[in-house]
């Protein structure tokens, strides 16, 4: 009997075949397909789109292709009643007002229904007042401005620049603040690659180029109305004054053309350091307020966005597996855009609808997967992950029993120098094994791998030799799966030289020139970094749902929960004074984690030793692969974070998209000088470290012999 | 019974390389952490360089950083150290260890006999 | 320059006992596990204490090993000629992300 017993092909033609058929060409039509009209979450636009992706998948040979719809809180904004920001004299005339809308880009002029810049879910409100530039608005600007510089935000209307950080925490910081208002705008520092035309001559973000966006907190919480399960047709929907992670004081993000006119004025404290400046010509002065002649000027802001209850509809696609049907490998991106999404999301749906196409190809000729794969097009991303949330939390009992692994595909593309992949440690040895065998798409790697390019120009900064795979945190729909559900989650992209483009993310980020024409004029146009991805992804997905033993490798979460526990150590190694007075050990972590070291060996010895022919061994020693994920999930959650379950990660506190490692001990020592109770607050850590190691022990412990 | 067996030591020039093997056997290979360790005359043991199980995360000492690469075989049970620009104080008795614990480094339960590398023009 | 300090040496007659003292700092011993290794000469090392305190099958219940703090402590009773050999103490370093032997002592049998 073959390898794999699912399929009528010879095992090692399974996976060529499979990549053989991914064609970049397609790639690209169905990339242009997809960005000529915007598909904003909740428009009739984006249900029809759904309606065909939908068709072309049953089309492309999928068991069963069905939408999934909810009813969930959006937000747009007023269409007779625009968002804008002026300057106001003081008599209260409008001296100065923000665009309304961004010039459309060269064939677009006559497209309706694209939505004008605005933050979504702001509340509305008209506030006015003082200027302040508090930098990036992460945790640490604000510590600069409150502590050393004894500036105070309260009452004032913060500006900030995008980048470094999730655009939420930054209102959220400045709300702590006191503001009363937030103006988010792109610095030409951070959104403008020097040497690099603007479009539509280049792939830079022009003076009226706005980067739109959701500023929610919602920790995972999916629909602000009702967290934790989904908005069915008989939710139980919170009032809006309950409603999970929504901003308080009203939030706009404006161009830099726009922001130079109000920072040009700007007076009071000059910035602390070169760090706080960009590369407008502007002084970058902190304020608050005006300069000299412009003093009694004021900012005001006039935001009349509504949010709305509204439908949204998920595409999940089934191609049932032959030997274990009831074990759920998912591959999903989302559907919705702010506008074209000419990258963000349709480069990665594009993607996955050609894996669809090659996988369907092959079931055509009589093959399957040996496991269930399921095809997500998701909707809502862009509102905070909500059509992924929502059917996890409607499926939430299948997908702990049943969830091997999701993959994720928002975009394709965030630059073309190499690879980016962030996944759970149980995948490294995968993600390796695949790029070696795959051919890199990159210049002066002719007839090399993958693995070698990534290599040599993503380094590890901890293993030389080795390629950089990064934590997973949040900022996409992976979320639910992995932190709240404890599925192991990847995901890949091609990605920017981060050592030489210090940019945030990739300048036309959810702006209106994020068109189908910036991919195939800039960024890739044979369309071969795409395909790379492609196979990536595609290949994952194979090998999760193909191989007879889980391509999990447990060794690699004990590598890495070392490092982490050396990491956290050290950090709570700068207060040896308190670790002294109140006691505190990791004795227990570095046990646990030496623990999960030594069974997961023994695991993996008898691995290698088991009968694979014996199905039962076989499922067994597979559903202990699959459930190491899940075993780091703490059913009580992070403290006020209920929907972050995951002990080993988390995201940030301060930064949604960044992963954080032992989150718990983290955020207990986070500025632990400050605090008010430091005995309360080192009690707190104790805890922690008690989470973790317990955590950690107990899902060593479901490696170890069954009996 | 467990047994590791090096080879590939010698005499070199410095600014030459070196590649040690290391031979394992009578365990399962994969599951652990392999490490090298080395001696020089007449002084105590350095360790070198370690890679894990699994993937095979790659661990260097500061002194050889950069010139030294640490890698394995699963599928022939072999370590190696690739040693570059080799120096006279490079010299030492050089030991393959088997880590007791598993894929990261803890403990060394089984050495290997020690192989001699000299730098020396 | 190796960052766990012994004695260089240590002696004692036969039958009596001796202690070899490492010193380290918290982020090697204070949370790592220590082992000890004896080497023979013109031999190998020998595991002879693993995680602070257990023995590998094989060692005999002579030696025994303790940690404290940043401190660990190798005890040799009754001892006989055979014993005569260098050990070393040896452990994880958290900030160097390396292994760590100490300087070793020389046991002499008077």
């Known amino acids: 009997k073959s390898s794999n017993e699912a399929t009528n092909i010879t095992p090692k033609h399974n996976m060529k075949a499979f990549l053989d058929e991914l064609k970049a060409e397609n790639i690209k039509k169905f990339l242009y397909n997809f960005t000529q009209i915007p598909h904003l979450a909740g428009t009739e636009q984006n249900f029809q789109l759904a309606k065909q992706i939908q068709s072309q998948w049953k089309e492309f040979g999928l068991d069963s292709v069905e939408l999934a719809h909810y009813d969930v809180l959006l937000s747009y904004p007023n269409k007779t009643h625009p968002n804008y920001i002026s300057i106001i004299n003081e008599d209260g005339n409008e001296i100065f007002n923000t665009s309304l809308f961004e010039p459309p880009p060269p064939g677009y002029e006559n497209v309706s229904d694209i939505v004008p810049p605005f933050s979504a879910f702001s509340p509305q409100g008209m506030p006015e007042g003082d200027l302040v530039y508090v930098n990036y608005a992460r945790t640490e600007d604000f510590f600069k401005l409150e502590r050393d510089m004894k500036i105070n935000c309260s009452g004032k209307i913060v500006i900030a620049r995008y980048g470094k950080v999730f655009r939420g925490n930054k209102v959220k910081n400045a709300q702590l603040a006191g503001a009363k208002g937030v103006i988010l705008y792109s610095d030409p520092a951070d959104y403008f690659a020097p040497g690099v035309k603007s479009y539509p001559d280049g792939w830079n973000l022009p003076g009226g180029g706005v980067q739109r966006g959701n500023i929610l907190n919602l920790n995972g919480a999916g629909d602000p109305l009702t967290p934790g399960y989904p908005a069915n047709e008989y939710a139980y929907r919170r009032g809006i004054a309950e409603a999970v992670g929504l901003p308080s004081i009203p939030v706009h993000p404006i161009g830099y053309y726009d922001a130079q006119k109000l920072l040009e004025k700007m007076g009071g404290s000059a910035p602390p350091d070169s760090s706080w400046r960009g590369s407008l010509k502007v002084p970058y002065n902190v304020g608050p307020g005006f300069t000299g002649n412009f003093s009694t000027q004021k900012v005001k802001m006039h935001i009349h966005s509504t949010n709305e209850v509204t439908r949204i509809y998920n595409v999940i696609g089934t191609l049932r597996g032959a030997v274990e049907p009831d074990r759920y490998v998912i591959l999903g991106g989302h559907r919705d855009s702010w506008v074209f999404g000419g990258i963000d999301p349709q480069s990665g749906a594009a993607v996955v609808h050609e894996i669809v196409r090659s996988f369907g190809t092959l079931k055509k000729e009589g093959w399957r997967p040996r496991r269930t794969i399921l095809f997500a097009s998701w909707d809502a991303e862009e509102f905070g992950l909500l059509g992924s949330t929502e059917w996890a939390e409607e499926n939430s009992r299948l997908l702990q029993e049943r969830g091997v692994a999701y993959i994720n595909a928002d975009s394709s593309i965030e630059g073309n120098y190499t690879l980016r992949v962030d996944c759970t440690p149980l995948m490294y040895s995968l993600v390796h094994n695949l790029t070696k065998e795959l051919k890199s798409p990159d210049e002066g790697f002719e007839g090399k791998s993958l693995y070698e390019s990534w290599t040599k120009k993503s380094p590890s900064p901890e293993f030389s030799g080795m390629p950089r795979i990064s934590k997973l945190g949040s900022g996409n729909d992976f979320e639910v799966f992995f932190q709240r559900l404890g599925i192991a989650s990847g995901r890949a992209r091609y990605t920017k030289n981060w050592e030489t483009n210090k940019f945030s993310g990739y300048p036309l980020y959810h702006s209106v020139y994020e068109t189908y024409e910036l991919v195939e004029k800039f960024y890739d146009p044979m369309f071969k970094y795409h395909l790379t991805v492609a196979q990536v992804r595609g290949g994952m997905v194979f090998e999760l749902a193909n191989s007879i033993v889980l391509p999990f490798d447990c060794r690699d979460y004990a590598v890495v929960l070392r490092k982490y526990a050396d990491k956290i150590y050290s950090i709570s190694m700068k207060h040896p004074q308190e670790m002294k007075t109140y006691s505190v050990s990791f004795d227990s972590l570095f046990s646990a984690v030496k623990n999960f070291t030594e069974i997961a060996s023994k695991f993996s010895e008898r691995l290698q030793d088991f009968d694979k022919s014996n199905p039962i061994v076989l499922r067994m020693m597979n559903d202990q692969l699959m459930f190491l994920e899940r075993a780091f999930i703490d059913p009580l959650g992070l403290p006020d974070r209920p929907f972050y379950r995951h002990v080993i990660y988390a995201p940030s506190s301060h930064n949604k998209y960044a992963g954080e490692s032992f989150p718990g001990i983290y955020d207990a020592l986070f500025d632990i000088e400050s605090k008010v109770d430091p005995s309360k607050a080192w009690g707190e850590v104790k805890r922690q470290i008690y989470v973790a190691a317990f955590t950690v022990q107990a899902a060593a412990e479901t490696l170890s012999e069954v009996a | 019974e467990v047994q590791l067996v090096e080879s590939g030591g010698g005499l070199v020039q410095p600014g030459g390389s070196l590649r040690l093997s290391c031979t394992a056997s009578?365990?399962?290979?994969?599951?652990?952490?392999m490490s090298w360790v080395r001696q020089a005359p007449g002084k105590g043991l350095e360790w070198v360089s370690a890679i894990s199980g699994g993937y095979g995360a790659p661990y260097y000492a500061d002194t050889v950083k950069g010139r030294f690469t640490i890698s394995r075989d699963n599928s022939k049970n072999t370590l190696y150290l690739q040693m570059n620009s080799l120096r006279a104080e490079d010299t030492a008795v050089y030991y393959c260890?088997?880590?007791?614990?598993?894929?990261?480094?803890?403990?060394?339960?089984?050495w290997g006999q020690g192989i001699l590398v000299t730098v020396s023009s | 320059q190796s960052v766990l300090t012994q004695p260089p040496s240590v002696s004692a007659a036969p039958g009596q006992k001796v202690t070899i003292s490492c010193s380290g700092s918290?982020?090697?011993?204070?949370?790592?596990?220590v082992s000890w290794y004896q080497q023979l000469p013109g031999t190998a090392p020998k595991l002879l204490i693993f995680?602070?305190?257990k023995r590998p099958s094989g060692i005999p219940d002579r030696f025994s090993g303790s940690k404290s703090g940043t401190s660990a402590t190798l005890g040799i009773t009754g001892l006989q000629t055979g014993d005569e050999a260098d050990y070393y103490c040896g452990t994880w370093d958290s900030s160097l992300s390396a292994y760590v032997f100490g300087t070793g002592t020389k046991v002499t049998v008077l």
């Open positions: 009578g365990f399962i290979f994969s599951s652990y952490a």
């Open positions: 918290s982020s090697n011993i204070g949370n790592n596990y």
């Open positions: 260890a088997k880590d007791g614990v598993g894929a990261t480094p803890y403990y060394f339960d089984d």
């Open positions: 995680d602070n305190n």
